[in-house]
């Protein structure tokens, strides 16, 4: 006979897979940091399940997460950002699974914004610029950016360019003439912090000039 049959919810809970992943966002709201966790399995029954972080906190021993639909979330100034914290999934006072995590190694930057492309006729190139909120931050200032662009008709044929600045020049001769292009950008911590790619910026669309038949140049 199964040892799980007598005591309802708690024993049933121990049969489930409660593996989870988290990411931090530093100085996401002024000097406030955030931590977001979610279960790997979207079908986990999250009723009565809570997340708690303990250790490497300022002035408190532990903090509880707020639940927002299927994610668990904290926004606070109380992350020490030095050393490891223990993040646990709990039901009541019982911990079902825990992870030791240094919050500076799971940083997900904010998505870049204000992406734009300007065509320079004299230079025969396109200047790509974008902005990032991280230029103003105390901690996660150094990012690697991934600019991805494609001809709109090529569904999955993205060209990627990695750069550390927020400006990129695309040569006109490397692009198809009279074509519509989609371009987007994302960021990842590069020095002093580790973590994950940000969400993609909103896409920007631009059209390349036609070829001028007399010279073989694009208009």
């Amino acid at each position: 006979e199964s040892g799980y049959a007598q005591n309802g919810d708690l024993e049933d809970a121990e049969l489930d897979d409660y593996s989870f992943s988290c990411y931090s966002q530093l100085e996401v709201n002024g000097s406030q940091h955030s931590l977001t966790c979610a279960f790997e399995d979207p079908d986990v029954n999250t009723t009565n399940l809570e997340f708690e972080i303990c250790g490497a906190l300022v002035e408190v021993k532990c903090l509880n997460f707020r639940k927002l639909q299927e994610i668990y979330f904290i926004e606070t100034k109380k992350f020490l950002l030095i050393g490891k914290s223990n993040i646990c999934v709990k039901v009541g006072e019982k911990s079902l699974t825990c992870k030791k995590i240094d919050l500076t190694t799971i940083v997900k930057p904010e998505a870049p914004f204000d992406l734009s492309v300007i065509y320079r006729e004299g230079a025969n190139d396109f200047v790509v610029t974008f902005n990032t909120s991280h230029l103003q931050k105390k901690y996660v200032k150094v990012l690697m950016h991934d600019v991805a662009y494609r001809q709109e008709k090529d569904e999955n044929k993205w060209t990627h360019v990695n750069l550390s600045s927020t400006k990129l020049t695309l040569l006109q001769r490397k692009l198809q003439p009279a074509a519509m292009y989609e371009i987007k950008v994302r960021s990842i911590p590069d020095h002093y912090f580790k973590g994950f790619w940000s969400e993609w910026s909103p896409s920007y669309y631009f059209r390349t000039p036609e070829i001028n038949n007399s010279s073989g140049e694009m208009d």
């Epitope: 303990c54 250790g55 490497a56 021993k61 950002l81 030095i82 050393g83 490891k84 914290s85 223990n86 030791k100 240094d102 500076t104 190694t105 901690y139 020095h191 002093y192 912090f193």
Partner: nanobody, 118 residues
Framework: EVQLVESGGGLVQAGGSLRLSCESS????????MGWFRQAPGKGLEWLAA????????HYSDSVKGRFTISRDNAKNTVYLQMNSLRSEDTGRYYC???????????WGQGTQVTVSS
């Protein structure tokens, strides 16, 4: 077996400077937080400064803020404490600690003595 070794202590006049070093033989040094503590004669252990694995994040106690600077060199497995404007009350044994894991420092050195004379 020795895992954390402090050096750089000594006798210094008030107002002077010293630089303490702590070399680690722990394999996870470059991903571990590091800290400095001291124990003054007849007193308990006092936390002074801490630094994250990359050196990007540092914290100081009010008693040393603005006078002491913690830094690290992950290529040399070493953490430093630069101590300026030393005072007689800074006298004590200085210890480094490694791997701040859920509010507990996992490894400790044997300490180095600092004496500030007035």
């Amino acid at each position: 077996e020795v895992q954390l070794v402090e050096s750089g202590g000594g006798l210094v006049q008030a107002g002077g400077s010293l630089r303490l070093s702590c070399e680690s033989s722990i394999s996870t040094f470059s991903s571990d937080a590091m800290g400095w503590f001291r124990q003054a004669p007849g007193k308990g252990l006092e936390w002074l400064a801490a630094i994250g694995w990359s050196g990007a994040v540092t914290h100081y106690s009010d008693s040393v803020k603005g006078r002491f600077t913690i830094s690290r060199d992950n290529a040399k497995n070493t953490v430093y404490l630069q101590m300026n404007s030393l005072r007689s009350e800074d006298t004590g044994r200085y210890y480094c600690a490694e791997d701040y894991d859920t509010d507990v420092w996992q490894y400790w050195g044997q300490g180095t003595q600092v004496t500030v004379s007035s």
